[in-house]
Interface confidence: low
């Protein structure tokens, strides 16, 4: 037989269907020009050594075959001996490993069988009343089609569905939408109203995310605050990737889940902008402030649930970086300036109170003074840090205060407000005999000791009331007791204690009189 003709002889292999699960399937035949026809099919299974034969039976009962060799597509003309106007029955027989495998048959009128294309190009996916709506442009000159879809999830096989008849320049299909798993869809078309017309190939996969994007499961860690007053937020665990059906693995446009990082800077509420949204891949540097961090997942159907963390403020303090001078007009703070034209945010709150009670003040952009210092002043009338209690102060700086991720911590420290020298005076000073020439002096801790780093030392003063001689004894801020020795019996002494800060000398406590009894021997 000539290769261009259908061979009306017995095929060159035994006629026995193996009943194997593999083999040829999805046979499609159609007219491709005025006088030429094409049949194509799929072959499932190992392809080595397989020969395919296209079988054709005419309505007269005569049958013939085309030898296709290893190809799974074959063209013939209307001169090949095959009836094109009467219906013919076609199937493929594949001869492999000494056995024959047969495809299902198709019966059609070749001349009226037009090759239909699957949806080509962009298939638009949207959500409509809890269902999935797909829409695409009808391929050229192919208005009037039946459309089917098939869909699968990562864990389920293909399921077939019907889109119904289409008769317009655009075609559409309503499909089921899964809540929590991604789906792969494929569509195919065939000529409407043409008896036995072949289905097109399946379209390229359309990958659809679940209605609800997966909740992000991530963990963060925050590095130590660096010298520049910033600390890096790092992602310890990447968000779990959505499991995808087979045809969507690799590049699957449509199923992408975008994770965004929403930062909310809790400290320094008087600044212009408190929140910023970033891509999760771009991990920011943060100041030492307290933040709330949310990771928001979203897909093409919108945002999903988010996961929120609290990043506590860095409470590492720099006791010597801040100078505070209290004058008659008010109080001024000095600290090493960061750079030119910096905006500073000074935040303070009473120690031991909820973080929500922080107060803050934003300075205008300022340059360093000649000594390289930045300053902030307030009057007594403003009431700022006016109460005699311990305040926690943090100063933040930014050259771009409107950009949340460009703030840095300048310093954090404690400050005792109000009249610290008077308020810090130690009370309950008591004297106990210790030996024949020494006494033990005790006092209640100064209020300043509640303020870490503020109390520099206690000073105990002892005055000999006879000679008016005065001795002063420095005492560590953690101690509230000292032994005074070298005292003389029968002499009157007064003792006083004061509490000093780094920048203020305290007020002496009320004088406490005592003397050591003269010991009379029998």
């Amino acid at each position: 037989c000539r290769t261009s003709e259908c061979c009306f002889q017995d095929p060159p292999y035994p006629d026995a269907d193996s009943g194997s699960a593999s083999g040829p399937r999805d046979l499609r035949c159609y007219r491709i020009s005025s006088d030429r026809y094409e049949c194509s099919w799929q072959y499932e299974g190992p392809t080595a050594g397989v020969s395919h034969f296209l079988r054709c039976c005419l309505s007269s009962g005569r049958c013939c075959y085309f030898a296709a060799g290893s190809a799974t597509r074959l063209q013939f003309s209307d001169q090949a001996g095959v009836s094109v106007l009467y219906t013919v029955t076609l199937w493929v027989e594949s001869w492999a490993r000494n056995q024959t495998e047969k495809s299902p048959e198709v019966t059609l009128q070749l001349y009226n069988s037009v090759k239909y294309e699957p949806p080509l190009g962009d298939i638009k996916v949207s959500k409509l009343a809890g269902q999935l709506r797909m829409e695409w442009e009808t391929p050229d000159n192919q208005v009037g089609a039946e459309v089917q879809f098939r869909h699968r999830t990562p864990s389920s096989p293909w399921k077939l569905g019907d889109c119904g008849p289409q008769d317009d320049d655009t075609e559409s299909c309503l499909c089921p939408l899964e809540m929590n798993v991604a789906q792969e869809f494929q569509l195919r078309r065939r000529q409407l109203g043409s008896q036995g017309s072949s289905w097109s190939k399946w379209s390229s996969p359309v990958c659809v995310p679940p209605e609800n994007p997966p909740q992000p499961q991530v963990r963060f860690s925050v590095e130590q605050l660096g010298q520049d007053g910033r600390r890096r937020l790092t992602l310890k665990e990447q968000p779990t990737q959505l499991e995808l059906p087979e045809g969507c693995q690799g590049l699957a446009p449509g199923t992408e889940v975008t994770y965004r990082l929403q930062l909310h800077m809790l400290s320094c509420p008087c600044k212009a902008k408190a929140t910023r949204t970033l891509h999760l891949g771009k991990m920011p540097y943060l100041s030492g402030a307290a933040y709330n961090v949310a990771v928001i997942s979203s897909n093409q159907f919108g945002p999903g649930l988010n996961q929120t963390w609290h990043i506590p403020a860095d409470t590492h303090t720099e006791p010597v970086a801040l100078n505070i001078s209290v004058g008659t007009n008010g109080t001024t703070m000095y600290w090493p300036a960061r750079a030119q034209s910096m905006t500073y945010c000074i935040e303070w709150q009473p120690v031991g109170q909820d973080g929500g009670l922080a107060t803050c003040s934003l300075t205008a952009p300022q340059d360093p003074d000649p000594a390289g210092m930045a300053t902030y002043s307030w009057s007594r009338e403003s009431g700022a840090m006016g109460q005699e209690k311990c305040y926690y102060i943090t100063i933040f700086a930014s050259a771009h205060p409107e950009k949340l991720t460009l703030w840095s911590t300048v310093l954090s420290t404690y400050h005792f407000g109000g009249n610290a020298s008077a308020a810090g005076t130690p009370h309950h000073v008591s004297v106990k005999n210790h030996s024949l020439d020494s006494v033990s002096v005790d006092w209640a801790p100064s209020l300043l000791s509640t303020c870490p780093g503020v109390l520099k030392e206690y000073v105990v003063r002892c005055r000999d009331e006879d000679s008016k001689q005065v001795s002063e004894h420095p005492v560590q801020p953690t101690e509230t007791q000292v032994t005074l020795s070298g005292l003389r019996a029968g002499v009157a002494y007064t003792v006083q204690v004061r509490a000093d800060t780094a920048w203020l000398r305290g007020v002496w406590s009320q004088p406490q009189r005592f003397s050591i009894e003269v010991q009379v021997s029998d």
């Epitope: 094409e38 085309f66 030898a67 060799g69 290893s70 190809a71 074959l74 013939f76 090949a80």
Partner: nanobody, 123 residues
């Protein structure tokens, strides 16, 4: 990707013979049909003949049957077009191409063309 290279063309007297070669590199020819086409000046590319490489099945256009023979050398991954009893109307550039479509005579069904070799039949 398979690349094809034709050779063996030349000038020959009427009634003479030539043997053209089509050598493939970058892939095997086993899963292809190798077709020979001729293109005379100002004309479309026209099917001459083809061979299914895996089974050796050949196909020729009527006007060359009995004069032209297509064969292959499996180890060399090469197909030959033996041209005998040449006529002036056989003068053309000859190209080889690959297809997986059995019975394909349309150049549009072929891919991976070579650059061609000139055959001139002089009287």
């Amino acid at each position: 990707e398979v690349q094809l290279m034709e050779s063996g063309g030349g000038v020959v007297q009427v009634g003479g013979s030539l043997r053209l070669s089509c050598a493939a590199s970058g892939g095997t020819l086993y899963s292809y049909i190798v077709g020979w086409f001729s293109q005379a000046p100002g004309q479309d590319r026209e099917f001459v003949g083809a061979i299914e490489y895996s089974g050796g099945i050949t196909d020729y256009k009527d006007s060359v049957k009995g004069r032209f023979t297509i064969s292959k050398d499996n180890p060399k991954n090469t197909v030959f077009l033996q041209m005998d009893s040449l006529k002036p109307e056989d003068t053309a550039v000859y190209y080889c191409g690959l297809t997986r479509v059995v019975g394909a005579r349309n150049p549009g069904d072929y891919a991976y063309w070579g650059q061609g070799t000139q055959v001139t039949v002089s009287s």
